[in-house]
């Protein structure tokens, strides 16, 4: 008789999840010499241990602590790029501007990027059928708690001038409910971070509006200022240049300082 299985509203664990995490870990540690000491089997064991046999709505940050410890990594704290609702462009940017880092350029972010996972209470099985949706089911699910944990740590590590890339094409350029708005903004350390500089990416060259005047940007400015961190905002009108440089990263026109 088939055992009853909880049906969640979200997609199930990404197929070949264990193999993908392990392969990504091996690839990352080969490319990044400073992480060569990492034992990828231990990383996978710690990752698995965070959610296997646990109810997928009762995951805590503590569950991920062994993984966090194994994935401890130092990135230049003054070269951090946060992003909200514009992941692809942020990643394309750091692929070319190699001295800046998004969360997904770190080992833990790289391992989990675009993946979904969850287990089942009291069984060692991975649930490939469905996983909890953050809105419809529960917020303390394995994926959400993971990103909340690593995002908090990433923001806490930042110093000096921190940049955030925001999508000027969205109705809410700054969204309080995004990971950036709900986690990262509140975990920047005022004693270390001098300024948060927002880059508002326009949809195209013909859009000449000052999106730094957007009410949601003013809201972000207010939140940041109350935390005793300076805020600045720049309109970025040339996403076409990003894309040109992604295609031709060796072009000398793609190496300007920020």
């Amino acid at each position: 008789v088939p055992r009853w299985r909880q049906q969640w509203s979200g997609p199930g664990t990404t197929k070949r999840f264990p193999e993908t995490v392990l392969a990504r870990c091996v690839k990352y540690t080969e490319i990044h010499p400073e992480m060569r000491h990492v034992d990828c089997q231990s990383v996978w064991d710690a990752f698995k241990g965070a959610f296997i046999s646990k109810h997928p709505c009762n995951i805590t940050e503590e569950d991920y602590q062994p993984l966090m410890k194994l994935g401890t990594q130092t990135v230049p704290c003054n070269k951090i790029l946060l992003w909200s609702r514009i992941k692809d462009l942020a990643h394309q940017f750091t692929q070319v501007q190699r001295d800046m880092f998004t969360l997904e350029d770190t080992l833990l972010g790289y391992l989990a990027d675009d993946l979904t996972w969850c287990g089942e209470f009291n069984t060692s099985k991975i649930n490939y059928q469905s996983c909890p949706d953050w809105r419809k089911d529960c917020s303390n699910n394995p994926v959400s708690v993971f990103w909340k944990t690593v995002s908090r740590r990433f923001a806490e590590a930042a110093c000096d001038v921190v940049h955030v890339m925001l999508n000027g094409s969205r109705s809410k350029i700054f969204d309080k409910n995004s990971t950036f708005g709900s986690v990262e903004v509140h975990n920047l350390q005022p004693e270390k971070v001098q300024t948060l500089e927002a880059w508002v990416i326009h949809g195209g060259r013909e859009d000449s509006r000052d999106l730094c005047q957007d009410p949601t940007i003013k809201e972000l400015e207010s939140i940041i200022s109350k935390r005793n961190i300076q805020f600045s905002c720049k309109n970025i009108y040339r996403p076409d240049k990003f894309l040109q440089c992604v295609k031709n990263p060796e072009d000398s026109s793609c190496t300007s300082e920020i």
């Epitope: 905002c233 720049k234 009108y237 040339r238 240049k241 040109q244 920020i258």
Partner: antibody, heavy 121, light 105 residues
Framework: QVQLVESGGGLVQPGGSLRLSCAAS????????MNWVRQAPGKGLEWVSG????????YYADSVKGRFTISRDNSKNTLYLQMNSLRAEDTAVYYC??????????????WGQGTLVTVSS | DIELTQPPSVSVAPGQTARISCSGD??????VSWYQQKPGQAPVLVIY???NRPSGIPERFSGSNSGNTATLTISGTQAEDEADYYC????????FGGGTKLTVL
């Protein structure tokens, strides 16, 4: 080293046409967007027109839209500005300028020496 | 389009600090570059992205930008710094300020 050399300027009557050229050397021409900036005698700088690295996108100041056409030939490392229906107010030194600042910001790191266009009857 | 306004002229004694302003509505929301132009010559980029100096430009040139004003500062001004200075920004089209004539007394 980067070199931009403009040519094709001269005296032309109102309503006439002129074609400016800018020969580029010392860098990979096809990697850079290029622009024309002009300066009327005794006046400030005014951006005229720009073109993307492969020529697929062109941009114009309102004052020249419909009259000027920017183009480039990457095989010849040359930038062009075809100027039609010229007016007295188009009289200026025309500079060819390389657009730099790939991601976040746009500026002109290299300029030619300029070529003078005089529109007068 | 943003409008950039510069004072027509600024005077400074040699060795003193010259400050050239470039004002515009919320200009701090845009990156600003500065160009130096000497008579009969093409402009030369001296500051880009608000405060960055291209290689070959002396350290005495610096820039800042916030609120409604961007500023080019020349510390320990030298006679050779006498020139016209233009600020420039971008909001889908390139915009230049009207220029400032710097006179070294």
């Amino acid at each position: 080293q980067v070199q931009l050399v403009e040519s094709g300027g001269g005296l032309v009557q109102p309503g006439g046409s002129l074609r400016l050229s800018c020969a580029a050397s010392g860098f990979t021409f096809s990697s850079y967007a290029m622009n024309w900036v002009r300066q009327a005698p005794g006046k400030g700088l005014e951006w005229v027109s720009g073109i993307s690295s492969w020529g697929s996108s062109t941009y114009y100041a309102d004052s020249v839209k419909g009259r000027f056409t920017i183009s480039r030939d990457n095989s010849k490392n040359t930038l062009y500005l075809q100027m039609n229906s010229l007016r007295a107010e188009d009289t200026a030194v025309y500079y060819c300028a390389r657009e730099d600042g790939s991601y976040m910001t746009d500026y002109f790191a290299y300029w030619g020496q300029g070529t003078l266009v005089t529109v007068s009857s | 389009d943003i409008e950039l306004t510069q004072p027509p002229s600024v005077s400074v004694a040699p060795g003193q600090t010259a400050r050239i302003s470039c004002s515009g509505d919320n200009i701090g929301h845009y990156y600003v570059s500065w160009y130096q132009q000497k008579p009969g010559q093409a402009p030369v980029l001296v500051i880009y992205s608000d405060s960055n100096r291209p290689s070959g430009i002396p350290e005495r040139f610096s820039g800042s930008n916030s609120g409604n004003t961007a500023t080019l500062t020349i510390s320990g001004t030298q006679a050779e710094d006498e020139a016209d200075y233009y600020c420039q920004s971008y909001n889908g089209t390139y915009v230049f300020g009207g220029g400032t004539k710097l006179t070294v007394l």
